[in-house]
Amino acid sequence: MAVTACQGLGFVVSLIGIAGIIAATCMDQWSTQDLYNNPVTAVFNYQGLWRSCVRESSGFTECRGYFTLLGLPAMLQAVRALMIVGIVLGAIGLLVSIFALKCIRIGSMEDSAKANMTLTSGIMFIVSGLCAIAGVSVFANMLVTNFWMSTANMYTGMGGMVQTVQTRYTFGAALFVGWVAGGLTLIGGVMMCIACRGLAPEETNYKAVSYHASGHSVAYKPGGFKASTGFGSNTKNKKIYDGGARTEDEVQSYPSKHDYV
């Protein structure tokens, strides 16, 4: 039961995280005009990965796409790439994890296959989350650098008479969405990896032994002890089968014909 819950929760958390990464990537407010010196402005600027916007006091908003590819800063291109890689990996991870979910039956898919798929999707989610966090952090670092640079040359002009106020930019909402979403995707990926451990059938040499006691039908399944311990070599009445380590819910979900004697 715990494995199913962990896997399901991991999937849901990752789904929310990837939706957040997509939202952050599409958002226009990666950087917003710093209003520290002028808290009330008639023209408000904000920028995203794909376009920059200006919202006027009148309510009119004008957005212009970055129609050049070569003219853009390398850092911006890198951030775009990281976010897109994060989305692509996350989307593939989601697709894989859907088929890996324990609650979904697809043909006669082995538990080992589901475990592998869960692990694969978990790793994809982790990388996806890291890509998003890295992308957002690179952009944030770029903003901080530019902020202090523009603060240094805040006012330029002739004889201090005419002032050209340079617009400074600070963290926009998309950065926080990106960080949270990346973190959620990362957590979801870790949960999937944890769930995978519970799903994977361990390769052991353990033997489960069924004894026929006189008068009663008793099934004995050793849990974690070596099958040979204390039971010598009396093999007359015993049925021997490979008893791979299984989780509690697997025992409940898939009753074996050897469970009852």
Epitope: A42, V43, N45, S58, Q163, T164, T167
Partner: antibody, heavy 118, light 113 residues
Framework: QVQLQQSGAELARPGASVKLSCKAS????????INWVKQKTGQGLEWIGE????????YYSEKFRGRATLTADKSSSTAYMEFRSLTSEDSAVYFC???????????WDQGTAVTVSS | DIVMTQSPSSLPVTAGEMVTMSCKSS????????????LTWYQQKPGQPPKLLIY???TRESGVPDRFTGSGSGTDFTLTISSVQAEDLAVYYC?????????FGGGTKLERK
């Protein structure tokens, strides 16, 4: 078409208050910001402040802050400007105007003349 | 506050001639976000409210004759009337529409020579 209709001329005593109204029609009232501008006879234009009818946000010129209060009534599509502690310096024509693209005031009413006299 | 200075304060003209009037701001009105200058020009005739002519320093309002042209960037702006008509005799105001408080220039009065 877009129209702004202001109340009639006002005569007030020094120290009194006046409340000017500006009724908008021909558009959705909450869509555009309304500005108020003062013009003394034979002089230039002076911005008083603006109100965003949708949320009620107001911005004032420091000179008029505290004496002018801008409000908007969405149900009647009317903007109001209340002016307190009137002096002879407040005798002027007051315009309301709609702010549009470029933060430009592109529709103006005919103006309301306020005369402060004892 | 941004101070707007218009010159000349009075401009005598004759019909058909080209006139230019100047407007200077104490701060740049150029917005880096969209590379637009937030300067507006209005025309006011006696007994009438002002009429919008030009916004974003050079964009003509619909219905405004194309003899009116706005130009300039940053802190220096110009309004040009290519061929003055009798109906153009009025006071012209420039306005900072970039920052609160919106401030107007003192006006340039276009009068018959």
């Amino acid at each position: 078409q877009v129209q702004l209709q202001q109340s009639g001329a006002e005569l007030a005593r020094p120290g009194a208050s006046v409340k000017l109204s500006c009724k908008a029609s021909g558009y959705t009232f909450t869509s555009y910001v309304i500005n108020w501008v003062k013009q003394k006879t034979g002089q230039g234009l002076e911005w008083i402040g603006e109100i965003h009818p949708r949320g009620g946000n107001t911005y004032y010129s420091e000179k008029f802050r505290g004496r002018a209060t801008l409000t908007a009534d969405k149900s009647s599509s009317t903007a109001y400007m209340e002016f307190r502690s009137l002096t002879s310096e407040d005798s002027a024509v007051y315009f309301c105007a709609i702010l549009r693209r470029g933060n430009a005031m592109d529709y103006w009413d005919q103006g309301t003349a306020v005369t402060v006299s004892s | 506050d941004i101070v707007m200075t218009q010159s000349p304060s009075s401009l005598p003209v004759t019909a058909g001639e080209m006139v230019t009037m100047s407007c200077k701001s104490s701060q740049s009105l150029l917005n880096s976000g969209n590379q637009r200058n937030y300067l507006t020009w209005y025309q006011q005739k006696p007994g009438q409210p002002p009429k919008l002519l030009i916004y974003w320093a050079s964009t003509r309002e619909s219905g405004v004759p194309d003899r009116f042209t706005g130009s300039g960037s940053g802190t220096d702006f110009t309004l040009t009337i290519s061929s003055v008509q009798a109906e153009d005799l009025a006071v012209y105001y420039c306005q900072n529409s970039y920052n609160y408080p919106y401030t107007f220039g003192g006006g340039t009065k276009l009068e018959r020579k």
